[in-house]
């Protein structure tokens, strides 16, 4: 295949820590065109698998708010509107990139940090391990 | 009380794009430790609302690969293992940071972006609009 | 321009509700979360509770009780609080202002024009 | 809770004077503090954001500091403008806790 060469315009990469050292313009674009289906806001209390919204907030990491979900119940909730426990809630978790502030209390220096989160709750079928 | 000013060890801020564009050390820092529950790889299949994980590569973001979920039905699964319609499967969307290379093709310079992934689905009542 | 535009002025009896509205323009509505504070007359600022418009997350000041509900309808970008139940000590200069949940350093920078609510019998 | 107890309640002060407000948090905070000036009638404004940073627009007069327990607001010449009420609120705990307010009056 073609390869590219680097830009000529990139900045200068002179740094000893380059390349694990990056510069990073925090002018976010947002790709959220409105091709995307639109999110409901709503599907927290919707859901056969409800769950609450718990406010995570960090001002030393970006993003600093992070709401994140805890299903409400073990179990599902039934065409009758009562709890199955023949069927379980479980969270839909998620790996994110946040930038935490390094060191403490810079406003112009991060490194890049993994976090898992829980986005919503959805029901699923149990395993049953059986005893022999 | 003794004032602490803000942190003497922060990079310089001379920068014209001050504080817009910030350094950022890309070794991870991975705060998912075995405290948290384990993540399951099958609730894709087990779930009343099922789904599909598909691929997505872009060599100019950072990360290269995120994996993003399709419903695989309008309806959810019931009991009896077939599509119910009366309910509906809806994707679990959250926005999320990714690095995108900018200018292109540049190993050290990024720029901040928001980007709406389905990282899963949940089986929610419709909502039913009456007409009059 | 960013603002945050509040209903009018309300008068209402004890044990009934009150619905102030805050509408924003100017900026991305999901992007910032919208906090409500009040402040009785001759008092200070109290925190009343947060709404995420896009998460449809809330959290409340236990103060409250369960009779304060935060909502927010995206489509016209209009938050809304709703305090129920009404005293007399609920009366007060009600505010909007929104909160950049990216970089929670920017804090509460622009804030709505007050609604008074005053609560007689 | 987190209480914030600002000091002093009340101030009387002259143009061209230095004057510092305090804020304590009831226990140490790995927060940030903001500060907000609110003349009668008017919503309250931002000053300092993030304990040290000054907000848009805000005079250079203004400035910021603490960490822990104890921050400070600081204007180091007052200005006929700035005759106001002062808050601060303690950022990253819940709930967002303001101070009681000082009242910052002309001598």
């Known amino acids: 295949g073609i390869t590219i060469p680097r830009n000529p315009g990139c900045p200068n990469s002179e740094d000893k820590n380059f390349p694990r050292t990056v510069m990073v313009n925090l002018n976010i674009h947002n790709r959220n065109t409105n091709t995307n289906p639109k999110r409901s806001s709503d599907y927290y209390n919707r859901s056969t698998s409800p769950w609450n919204l718990h406010r995570n907030e960090d001002p030393e990491r970006y993003p600093s708010v992070i709401w994140e979900a805890k299903c409400r119940h073990l179990g599902c909730i039934n065409a009758d509107g009562n709890v199955d426990y023949h069927m379980n809630s479980v969270p839909i978790q998620q790996e994110i990139l946040v930038l935490r502030r390094e060191p403490p209390h810079c406003p112009n220096s991060f490194r890049l940090e993994k976090i898992l989160v829980s986005v919503g709750c959805t029901c699923v079928t149990p395993i049953v391990h059986h005893v022999a | 009380g003794i004032t602490i000013p803000r942190n003497p060890g922060c990079p310089n801020s001379e920068d014209k794009n001050f504080p817009r564009t910030v350094m950022v050390n890309l070794n991870i820092h991975n705060r998912n430790t075995n405290t948290n529950p384990k993540r399951s790889s099958d609730y894709y299949n087990r779930s009343t609302s099922p789904w599909n994980l598909h691929r997505n590569e872009d060599p100019e973001r950072y990360p290269s690969v995120i994996w993003e979920a399709k419903c695989r039905h309008l309806g959810c699964i019931n009991a009896d293992g077939n599509v119910d319609y009366h309910m509906n499967s809806v994707p679990i969307q959250q926005e999320i940071l990714v690095l995108r290379r900018e200018p292109p093709h540049c190993p050290n310079s990024f720029r901040l972006e928001k980007i709406l992934v389905s990282v899963g689905c949940t089986c929610v009542t419709p909502i039913v609009h009456h007409v009059a | 321009e960013v603002q945050l535009v509040q209903s009018g002025a309300e008068v209402k009896k004890p044990g009934s509700s009150v619905k102030v509205s805050c509408k924003a323009s100017g900026y991305t509505f999901t992007d910032y979360e919208i906090h409500w504070v009040r402040q009785a007359p001759g008092q200070g600022l109290e925190w009343i509770g947060v709404n995420d418009p896009d998460s449809g997350g809330t959290l409340y000041n236990q103060k409250f009780d369960g009779r304060v509900t935060l909502t927010a309808d995206e489509s016209t970008s209009t938050a809304y609080m709703e305090l129920s139940s009404l005293r007399s000590e609920d009366t007060a200069v009600y505010y909007c202002?929104?909160?950049?949940?990216?970089?929670?350093?920017?804090?509460?920078?622009?804030w709505g024009q007050g609604t008074t609510v005053t609560v007689s019998s | 809770d987190i209480q914030m107890t600002q000091s002093p309640s009340s101030l009387s002060a002259s143009v061209g004077d230095r004057v510092t407000i305090t804020c304590s948090a009831s226990q140490g905070i790995r927060s940030y503090i903001d500060w907000f000036q609110q003349k009668p009638g008017k919503s309250p404004k931002r000053l300092i954001y993030a304990t040290f940073d000054l907000a848009s627009g805000v005079p250079s007069r203004f400035s910021g500091s603490g960490s822990g327990t104890d921050y400070t607001l600081t204007i180091s010449s007052l200005q006929p403008e700035d005759f106001a009420t002062y808050y601060c609120r303690q950022v990253g705990n819940y709930p967002g806790t303001f101070g009681q307010g000082t009242k910052l009056e002309i001598k």
């Open positions: 202002t929104r909160y950049d949940k990216w970089y929670s350093f920017e804090g509460m920078d622009i």
